[in-house]
């Protein structure tokens, strides 16, 4: 059962994990969430009657009934773990604690003129986990404007304390805003041989980057493979830093692959949801349960199901024994991972898929593509979204993109005579325009914010959102694409496709079926070669073929540039201008998504 | 509701500089531009410049050396300072709200005529 | 500059008759965007100008169905097509794709 609401004046009594520090009760809930076993937490608030020493602890807690007796305790406020819900979760932080201290290993001092600043020095050094700030009331003059960059260990606080004019908060590195490189590749035959911090058992090497990449300290890993000759060290994922916050000494060793934490681009490729099956993979732990069940997809539901399993493994049915049911073996342990992986035993294994909600909605895979072809068909592109006006009759006006539950990414060119959003409907999940009727159902929209600098799509800027009045319930027909990570910003995309309903020519009339082109994107020097009158800047993005052919035209602005990359589907641009349409050596213009990411998140995370 | 109004002196000496305010309510400047549209008696309209809503200026190639167009964001208006008047200079001023984007002119203030003469 | 030409400099017309006005560019106005920005406004006499139509065709909320827009890169025809005594006025077409904007000289419609 899902609880949201947090107790107050309340403490559970009993199932300590272990202690943390944290500046509020939410943030401890956070905390508490993304912990692999804890259920349940209290929190101590500052308060008179309290110790200060317990003021800001948050004690993490675990129990096999999934609750704990409520004891009533001034200044104590208790909740429950996010894992119960099934709504998407996120460990950003935005906020700014004022008059706290976030005690932790200060490694980096600087002058800074705003604790913004401050936050932005943290979001973009590989180490910082949280910061404090000195603001320029705080009495010791040669602490003023101080800027204390800080890590620990479990990537909370040490110790909270109350200190007059300082403020802190924490990294913005889980709210996509880091400008950090994302670097996804992963070395085979390589081992960094660096300090460990950790490690723990892995089936692959995916899972243990993903791992580090949800570890606090980690900032890249080797893992070990079954192959690997020292038996003992099968499977292992080593857990790495150092202070350079790069791989200080890279050894060529066999059957061992290195990687890097994916922290940088975690908002646009799955960090937490192991989603595949392993064959022949016995995961050894904690056993919570054993349940019969038809198959090992069955098996994963259950322990998805089961709010503390963690792993699985399977064993299928010997011949017609039991109704052709396996056994499901639901098991968990204290860090999430197997105590041990033995192979050759027949199983099957995997892991809950209860952690993929912490994954952004946008990195779930959708069904195989059909290539080939200019129709698409129903489901291939399920954030691409149709946008009508109702005045002074109704049309498609522009494509757009569902970038999150609530919000349409698309063109602020599209909006030209449009003067409320009253006029407006988004319909998702359509693949013919005949398929809109009276009754269709559609979302409303509560508010156009185009970009301030918009004047003109030549000119760049031609970049807006949309507000829907209700919510979008994601399925396999309408769900949203990934932004791209800043950190990707090198990353050279060699699977893109432009989508929409517009012309197939440049004298033509709105297509019915949803059409798509694969087209390759052009360097912006290229670019700009094609069109000399402008100025092609770095916030603009082009594609086409040298020799034409293939293009976007009338009525798909606003519409995705969808890349594949990593088995991931990302913005990477908005359908904005051209000269013509598919013209010779013309290519199209898009809006870059990637540089428009932080105004993005800016206008859809405002309060 | 929006409203624009044009205010200013009636008669200008010539070669002096004209300075005339448009004052508006109902929205703000930094979400929507504001253009400057004159007409002389009796002819047609002119497009003389806009105040974009992110604080740029573009201008009418005609009179862009001797116009300047600025803001005030806090009193809501818009400036429009135009120098080395002429009597052919001598027309009615209107400001006017762009729509969501650049145009269309939903919305135009009633005009204020300017007199060039000595 | 972006010259557009209108024609006839003026009408007369009864009521209930159909009108075409003529508005001709010196370039095309088809941006790149896919958008062209050609508008139409009515100027009553003793009034401020009103918006008719943008996007060549595209008739904001209250103007009646009896106004209609046609054309496309640098030829354009507004067309009443039975006039009433409250269209009486002048008729300028603007253009908003290339900077700086323009107007069209303004064709003034009248009873005779």
């Known amino acids: 059962e899902c609880v949201t609401q947090l107790l107050k004046d309340t403490c559970f009594e009993g199932g300590d994990i272990t202690t943390v520090f944290t500046p509020s009760a939410k943030y401890c809930q956070v905390v508490c969430t993304y912990h692999p076993r804890c259920l349940l937490f209290t929190f101590t608030a500052e308060s008179p009657s309290e110790d200060p020493t317990r003021w800001f602890t948050c004690v993490l807690k675990d129990s096999v009934t999934e609750t704990l007796p409520r004891v009533n305790r001034t200044a104590a406020i208790s909740g429950y773990s996010f894992k119960q819900c099934s709504h998407q979760i996120s460990a950003c932080n935005k906020d700014i604690y004022v008059d706290l201290d976030m005690k932790g290993i200060n490694y980096n001092s600087s002058v800074a003129k705003s604790a913004q600043e401050c936050q932005e020095r943290c979001t973009d050094d590989v180490h910082c986990h949280f910061f404090t700030y000195a603001t320029r009331q705080f009495p010791s003059l040669e602490h003023r404007n101080i800027c204390l960059l800080k890590h620990t260990q479990t990537g909370t606080p040490t110790r909270i304390t109350k200190l007059d004019k300082v403020v802190s908060g924490f990294s913005l590195k889980s709210c996509a805003l880091s400008n950090l490189a994302c670097i996804r590749d992963i070395f085979p035959n390589t081992v960094f041989a660096d300090s460990n911090i950790d490690s723990v058992m892995a089936p692959d090497a995916f899972v243990c980057g993903r791992i580090c990449t949800h570890h606090p300290g980690c900032l890249f890993f080797t893992f070990f493979s079954q192959e690997w000759p020292k038996e003992s060290q099968r499977n292992l994922c080593l857990l790495k830093t150092s202070e350079s916050g790069l791989p200080s000494t890279r050894i060529k060793k066999s059957k061992a692959l290195s990687g890097f934490s994916l922290q940088s681009c975690r908002h646009s490729i799955p960090v937490f949801c192991h989603s595949s099956f392993y064959h022949d993979t016995d995961f050894l732990g904690e056993e919570l349960d054993i349940v019969a069940a038809k198959s090992h997809e069955a098996c994963q539901k259950l322990c998805t199901n089961a709010v503390r399993c963690q792993f699985f493994t399977y064993t299928p049915a010997q011949a017609s024994c039991n109704e052709g049911k396996g056994k499901c073996y639901l098991k968990l342990s204290s860090n999430g991972s197997p105590t041990k992986i033995l192979h050759g035993r027949g199983g099957i294994s995997g892991y809950t898929l209860r952690l993929c909600k912490m994954d952004n909605e946008c990195t779930t895979k959708i069904k195989p593509r059909i290539v080939g072809g200019t129709a698409s068909v129903r489901g291939e592109w399920p954030w691409q979204v149709t946008l009508h006006t109702t005045s002074p009759t109704q049309r498609h006006l522009c494509g757009g993109s569902i970038i999150g539950n609530q919000w349409i990414l698309t063109a602020a060119h599209c909006f030209y005579g449009v003067e409320s959003p009253k006029i407006l409907r988004v319909y998702s999940g359509i693949l013919n325009q005949s398929e809109i009727k009276e009754d269709t159902s559609f979302f409303g929209v509560q508010e156009i914010i185009i970009h301030d600098q918009y004047k003109m799509a030549e000119s760049g800027y031609d970049i807006a959102l949309l507000k829907l009045e209700t919510t979008v319930n994601y399925t396999d027909s309408q769900r949203p694409i990934c932004l791209p990570s800043k950190g990707d910003r090198n990353v050279i995309y060699t699977d893109c496709w432009v989508t929409g309903w517009g012309y197939r020519k440049l004298r033509d009339k709105i297509q019915n079926t949803l059409q798509k082109a694969k087209i390759p994107l052009v360097t912006n020097e290229e670019c700009q070669k094609r069109y000399r009158g402008h100025k092609i800047t770095h916030k603009m993005i082009c594609a086409g073929y040298r020799e034409g052919g293939k293009d976007a035209c009338k009525g798909d602005s606003g519409g995705p540039l969808s890349c594949k990359h990593n088995e991931v589907w990302h913005l990477v641009g908005i359908t904005s201008w051209g000269e013509g349409c598919a013209q010779r050596e013309r290519p199209g213009v898009y809006t870059n998504v990637v540089e428009y990411v932080d105004w993005i998140l800016e206008k859809t995370q405002a309060v | 509701q929006v409203q624009l109004k044009e205010s200013g002196p009636g008669l200008v000496q010539p070669s002096q500089t004209l300075s005339l305010t448009c004052t508006v309510s109902g929205f703000s400047l930094t979400t929507y531009h504001v253009h400057w549209v004159r007409q002389p008696p009796g002819k047609g309209l002119e497009w003389m410049g806009i105040?974009?809503?992110?604080?740029?200026?573009s201008y009418n190639s005609v009179l862009k050396s001797r116009l300047s167009i600025s803001r005030d964001i806090s009193k809501s208006q818009v400036f429009l300072k135009m120098s080395s008047l002429q009597t052919e200079d001598t027309a009615t001023y209107f400001c006017?709200?762009?729509?969501?984007?650049?145009?269309?002119?939903?919305?135009w203030g009633q005009g204020t005529l300017v007199t060039v003469s000595s | 500059d972006v010259v557009l030409t209108q024609t006839p400099g003026s009408l007369s017309v009864t009521l209930g008759q159909q009108v075409s006005i003529s508005c001709r560019s010196s370039q095309s106005l088809e941006s790149r965007d896919g958008n062209t920005y050609l508008e139409w406004y009515l100027q009553k006499p003793g009034q401020s100008p009103q918006v008719l139509l943008y996007?060549?065709?595209n008739r904001l909320s209250g103007v009646p169905d009896r106004f209609l827009g046609r054309g496309s890169g640098a030829d354009f025809t507004l067309k009443i097509s039975r006039v009433e005594p409250e269209d009486l006025g002048v008729y300028y077409c603007?253009?908003?794709?290339?900077?700086?904007?323009?107007f069209g000289s303004g064709t003034k419609l009248e009873m005779k």
């Open positions: 996007g060549v065709s």
């Open positions: 105040m974009w809503r992110d604080g740029d200026t």
């Open positions: 006017a709200r762009g729509g969501t984007l650049t145009t269309p002119f939903t919305y």
């Open positions: 603007f253009q908003a794709t290339h900077g700086p904007f323009t």
